[in-house]
């Protein structure tokens, strides 16, 4: 066990031309915070895709007002260290996502609205105990410069955290087999620990955090009966080819779970729901303080000072269970109403709502801009009881949510040709043709094929949009 | 960092094709881009000698450059290169490769590389 | 071929003085103000000052200004420094996607 510290050091424009517009502005105040996403190995996966490793997320940083005219600076930044908190061994290689959010604090209805700034992803390697490693990463026009670090917690250490230490019980030496634990040399390394929920009568290890099975039995934890398993396998093979006449025991037959446990089948096993006082995989660890660590996912527990007496998890958002070891999907429920994105942020539940929506449900129906429902700098642009949205440079879609190149769409009109520049996408025309997206011919004599020509719009006039 | 970087070798002798190589780096090809190569010769001005347009991968050459440039990409390894052809002593120059991201002006140049051209 | 013509070629003055570089273009840039303005010290590439004929890029100095537009261009040095001294070129973008760069300003401290 240990934890994964991420210290973020500044975040502003990058290096070289096009600053970025400032996120805030007088009339839309706003204050950043950041997220971070961990991932055992050197994952390719998707954004989306489930945090391992673990997540967190940072207080809100100050307050901060664009001044009219000044560039983007760097933005005061939120106190404190990012933690993520990792139960098992640190893996060594991880991947990670670093998520830059905006929160507007103008009159929004329904409270505050959260939007993407930037998104930063890597792949590192990385030994725990080890010193702060600096990065600088950076999206679009935006750098972020932050530290890492990993660290295990006592009684662990080593560059995995699985190797356990504990203090000698006789001032000489350590017990049978057992070395002293550098660079702690007053402690002595403590006996192997399996992977958690191995099951201790049917499983064993030779490594820290492995669970191999004795004969008959099998499952990642070693609490599948062989006999059973095939026939219990949705995508086993079929009874007659396995001699299984009869579907065997299910896993709940005989209920498993010890003191009081209820019992549910999961697709491969079963799943205990233990009473407070015990836990384990089948309920079966009881005497349990709150000395000995039992909530799990940050809960925090409370009472149980002695063994006889019970102890509480008060669970944090997105976990519960008796010792908070189960991941609620709150997402599952819902809960975001006329297509808005739930997003599961651990300390709260937001919804992302679509173009048109607003509220912390996106229960409201916005006809026109007051929602200010355009992400990622995108420009509200009202008409006819609806609205739509002109997007910032790299962002497309309906509410400027996507992640686009402005000129993946061939915006320029034939033959004109596109640059993405950072105030917008530019299109410069063939010769012949004129107008915003090269739409217009140029006729032999000069004027224009322009029903009417605004005002200034010249042959050849280039045009940029937001 | 966006950055670029000019290669290729010192000298050349006359009557060869030079060819040099643009590292960037920072930046990919998929947005839209127009990725140019200027030359100056010594104690002279700039001069432009063309360019590659990233988004259909179309070139423009000066007009004295047209039948002795060739410009081309290689987006694997993040490279654009620039071949002249039958190269004489008045090709000696500071070789800048460039980035043009609209409005017509080069924001990004490379540091430049000295070829000469003598037997 | 276009040309663009810069005058005067070489200029000498003095600190605090105000300079003035001109730009003719024998046709007409695109969009009327697709021209820019480098700066050039020995041994280093161009330095991007003004694009779209007026714009200042980011980080450099309010002193530098441009004006002009179609054939006509001017850039304007406020109050000259001893850090000015160097060559200034114009450059244009025309239709056609062609590009030209100016004969260059050599712009010397008294």
């Known amino acids: 066990a240990g934890v994964f510290e991420l210290q973020i050091h500044s975040f502003g424009p990058g290096p070289g031309p096009g600053a970025p517009r400032s996120p805030c502005s007088a009339r839309l105040p706003c204050r950043l915070f950041f997220r971070v996403c961990l991932k055992p190995g050197l994952s390719e996966e998707a954004a989306e895709s489930p945090c391992a490793l673990g997540a967190a997320l940072s207080a809100r940083g100050p307050v901060y007002t664009e001044q009219p005219g000044a560039p983007a600076p760097d933005l005061p930044l939120p106190d404190g260290l990012l933690q993520v908190p990792f139960r098992d061994a640190w893996p060594g290689t991880f991947s990670f996502i670093i998520e830059t959010w905006r929160e507007e604090l103008g009159d929004q209805i329904g409270g505050p609205a959260w939007s993407l700034l930037a998104r930063v992803a890597g792949r590192r390697r990385l030994a725990a105990g080890g010193p702060w490693a600096r990065d600088i990463q950076r999206a679009g026009a935006w750098e972020l410069r932050f530290s890492y670090r990993a660290r295990c917690e006592p009684p662990a250490v080593g560059t995995a955290c699985t190797r356990l230490c504990r203090p000698r019980s006789a001032p000489s030496r350590c017990g049978p087999g057992l070395r002293p634990c550098a660079p702690l040399e007053d402690e002595c390394e403590a006996p192997l620990v399996c992977r958690a929920g191995c099951s201790p009568e049917h499983g064993f290890c030779e490594q820290p955090g492995e669970c191999r099975c004795l004969e008959g039995w099998t499952g990642p934890l070693c609490t599948v009966p062989v006999s059973t398993s095939s026939c219990l396998s949705p995508r086993g093979p079929s009874s007659a080819t396995t001699g299984c006449l009869v579907p065997g025991p299910g896993p709940c037959d005989g209920n498993p779970c010890a003191n009081g446990g209820s019992c549910s089948e999961t697709p491969r096993s079963f799943e205990c729901t233990c009473p407070r006082g015990f836990y384990g995989l089948r309920c079966e660890v009881s005497g349990v303080t709150c000395a000995d660590g039992p909530c799990f996912n940050g809960g925090l527990c409370v009472g149980g000072a002695d063994p006889d007496s019970a102890y509480i998890c008060h669970c944090p958002p997105g976990f519960q269970g008796s010792n908070c070891e189960k991941r609620v999907d709150r997402c599952s429920l819902q809960p975001c109403r006329n297509g808005g994105l739930c997003l599961d942020l651990g300390h709260a539940l937001r919804c992302r709502c679509r173009a048109g929506f607003a509220g912390p449900r996106c229960e409201h129906d916005l006809d026109d801009c007051a929602g200010r429902a355009c992400a990622n700098g995108g420009t509200c642009v009202e008409g006819g009881g609806a609205h739509r949205c002109s997007c910032a440079l790299g962002f497309g879609g309906r509410d400027c949510r996507e992640r686009a190149d402005p000129c993946a769409a061939r915006p320029c009109a034939h033959g004109g040709r596109c640059y993405a520049h950072f105030s917008g996408l530019v299109c410069a025309c063939a010769p012949g043709y004129m107008g915003a997206r090269c739409e217009f011919p140029v006729h032999p004599d000069g004027a224009s094929a322009l029903p009417a020509a605004p005002p200034g719009l010249r042959p050849g006039d280039p045009q940029r949009y937001l | 960092q966006v950055t670029l970087r000019e290669s290729g070798p010192a000298l050349v002798k006359p009557t060869q094709t030079l060819t040099l190589t643009c590292t960037f780096s920072?930046?990919?090809?998929?947005?839209?881009?127009?990725m140019g190569w200027v030359r100056q010769a010594p104690g002279q001005g700039l001069e432009w000698m063309g360019t590659i347009y990233t988004g259909d991968y179309s070139t423009d050459y000066a007009s004295w450059a047209k039948g002795r440039v060739t410009i081309s990409v290689d987006t694997s390894k993040n490279q654009f290169s620039l071949k002249l052809s039958s190269v004489t002593a008045a090709d000696t120059a500071v070789y800048y490769c460039?980035?043009?991201?609209?409005?017509?002006?080069?924001?990004?140049w490379g540091q430049g590389t000295l070829v000469t051209v003598s037997s | 071929d276009i040309q663009l013509t810069q005058s005067p070629s070489f200029l000498s003055a003095s600190v605090g003085d105000r300079v003035t570089i001109t730009c003719q273009s024998t046709?007409?840039?695109?969009?009327?103000?697709?021209l820019s303005w480098y700066q050039q010290k020995p041994g280093q590439p161009p330095k991007l000052l003004i694009y779209?004929?007026?714009n200042l890029e980011i980080g450099v100095p309010s002193r530098f200004s441009g004006s002009g537009s179609g054939t006509d261009f001017t850039l304007t040095i406020n109050s000259l420094e001893a850090e000015d001294a160097a060559t200034y070129y114009c450059q244009g973008y025309y239709s056609g996607y062609s590009y030209a760069f100016g004969g260059g300003t050599k712009v010397e401290i008294k």
């Open positions: 460039a980035r043009h991201t609209g409005y017509g002006y080069f924001g990004l």
């Open positions: 920072g930046f990919s090809l998929s947005s839209s881009y127009d």
């Open positions: 046709e007409s840039v695109y969009g009327s103000d697709w």
């Open positions: 779209q004929a007026s």
